[in-house]
């Protein structure tokens, strides 16, 4: 995401295009706060974050408001007025989607069909993993939409399920970061559960696809 | 079929102006990016200019900011480009380009998948 | 400001061999890249975008790859209609275009 200039790493994260976080790693400034300037538009001038993340008493990142900003980002981390990385990104590559909200199931006999509420832009994937505690391995499907059925249950095993949403590579590109999981839900014979036996613990979600 | 079709080039004294338009057919216009594009023998390809589908954002490459305008007409499916202080480095042909992603909710820059036949500027006294 | 690098600037190539023509960047721009081939007195055509993934109706012997600063552009076996000039474009920042590679029949 951001080749190093002066040793300082960046990564950036928008966040259901509400929130643009940008975060720094520069070891040669540890023990130092930097600032970051931006503008949205390359004939503004540029404004100084108000809201820093710190990390270890330090400035480690920024947080910007930029609910559905159509633009690229233009930014410069500085100590004190020299510039130590500057670069400017079209922000939505780095799009993580908000995790699936209103997550419902409806059962019938071997199937379940899963739906949430569809986010408000599109070229997204509407991911369902799942498993049986006597599964090894978490099974996947995705569709376009939030309304992806899953054919082949076994009626009488208890069934774990979550949801995530992910941007299609080949519209948003590699870099950005699928939702966090919808919370672990299960489900035996159509009906919830408060847990199903045995089930191992379920995987951290990773950031790459 | 999908189709670019511009039109407005020709010869032109320096400092005065001139309007290209891009005729689009055959797709949703109103819900894609249209850029300009111009090619020089000695520069090659350069992009121009940028308008979102909606109109709401606009970019220039720096070597036109300021003295090139684009705009678009949704209802006549028309992409234009007005030029105004032009200058000797502006001669090229001028191509009109679409931009690959149709827009969902959610501007997506990227590559540009239709192009225009083109039409030549000739800036010269 | 990316500056996009094509090499070599000509490619004399025989049909039915391989050609390999590439593109550098001059900071990352990941895998936001296209190709493009432009034949005399003819607009452009897409032929990749996103580094590796071949535009609608391009055929299988065009092949992309790379990725942050390093990017090539394949074709397997030269048609007589393959001869062209090709070019790369990123788009992770603005859209900027090499300067391109001229491939022409050995």
């Known amino acids: 995401q951001g080749g190093a200039a002066e040793g300082v790493q960046i990564q950036i994260i928008y966040f259901n295009l509400e929130t643009v976080q940008v975060t720094w790693n520069a070891s040669k400034y540890s023990r130092t706060n930097l600032t970051f300037h931006y503008r949205f538009n390359g004939d503004e001038a540029y404004d100084q974050c108000t809201n820093y993340l710190l990390q270890e008493g330090h400035t480690s990142g920024c947080l910007l408001d930029a609910e559905q900003r159509d633009d690229i980002l233009y930014f410069s981390i500085r100590n004190g007025t020299h510039p130590v990385f500057t670069a400017s990104r079209w922000m939505v590559y780095y799009l993580k989607p908000s995790s699936p909200k209103h997550v419902r199931f409806s059962w019938h006999q071997d199937a379940v069909t899963v739906t949430c509420s569809d986010l408000s832009y599109g070229d997204l994937l509407y991911e369902v993993q799942y498993r049986s505690p006597f599964d090894t391995e978490w099974q996947s499907k995705q569709e376009n939409t939030c309304n992806v059925t899953i054919e082949g249950l076994d009626a009488e095993k208890c069934y774990s399920f979550w949801v995530r949403v992910k941007a299609m590579e080949d519209v948003y590109g590699p870099d950005t970061y699928p939702s966090d999981w919808s919370e672990v839900t299960c489900w035996q014979r159509g009906e919830i559960r408060d847990a199903c036996a045995e089930t191992p613990t379920p995987p951290k979600p990773k950031l790459s696809k | 079929q999908v189709q670019l079709v511009e039109s407005g080039g020709g010869v032109v004294q320096p400092g005065r102006s001139l309007r290209l338009s891009c005729a689009a057919s055959g797709f949703t216009f109103s819900s894609y990016g249209m850029h300009w594009v111009r090619q020089t023998p000695g520069k090659g390809l350069e992009w121009v200019a940028v308008?979102?589908?909606?109109?709401?954002?606009?970019y220039y490459a720096d070597s036109v900011k300021g003295r090139f305008t684009i705009s678009r007409d949704n209802s006549k499916n028309t992409l234009y480009l007005q030029m105004n202080s032009l200058r000797a480095e502006d001669t090229a042909v001028y191509y009109c380009?679409?931009?690959?992603?149709?827009?969902?909710?959610?501007?997506?820059?990227?590559?540009?998948?239709?192009w225009g036949q083109g039409t030549m500027v000739t800036v010269s006294s | 400001e990316i500056v996009m690098t094509q090499s070599p600037a000509t490619l004399s190539v025989s049909p039915g061999e391989r050609a390999t023509l590439s593109c550098r960047a001059s900071q990352s721009v990941s895998s936001n890249l296209g190709w493009y081939q432009q034949k005399p007195g003819q607009a452009p055509r897409l032929l990749i975008y996103?580094?590796?993934t071949r535009a609608t109706g391009i055929p299988a012997r065009f092949s992309g790859s790379g990725s942050g600063t390093e990017f090539i552009l394949t074709i397997s076996s030269l048609q007589s209609e393959d001869f062209a000039v090709y070019y790369c474009?990123?788009?992770?920042?603005?859209?900027?275009f090499g300067q391109g590679t001229k491939v022409d029949i050995k």
């Open positions: 474009q990123e788009y992770n920042n603005w859209w900027t």
């Open positions: 380009a679409r931009d690959r992603i149709m827009v969902r909710g959610v501007i997506i820059p990227h590559v540009f998948d239709i």
């Open positions: 308008m979102w589908y909606d109109g709401r954002n606009k």
């Open positions: 996103g580094a590796s």
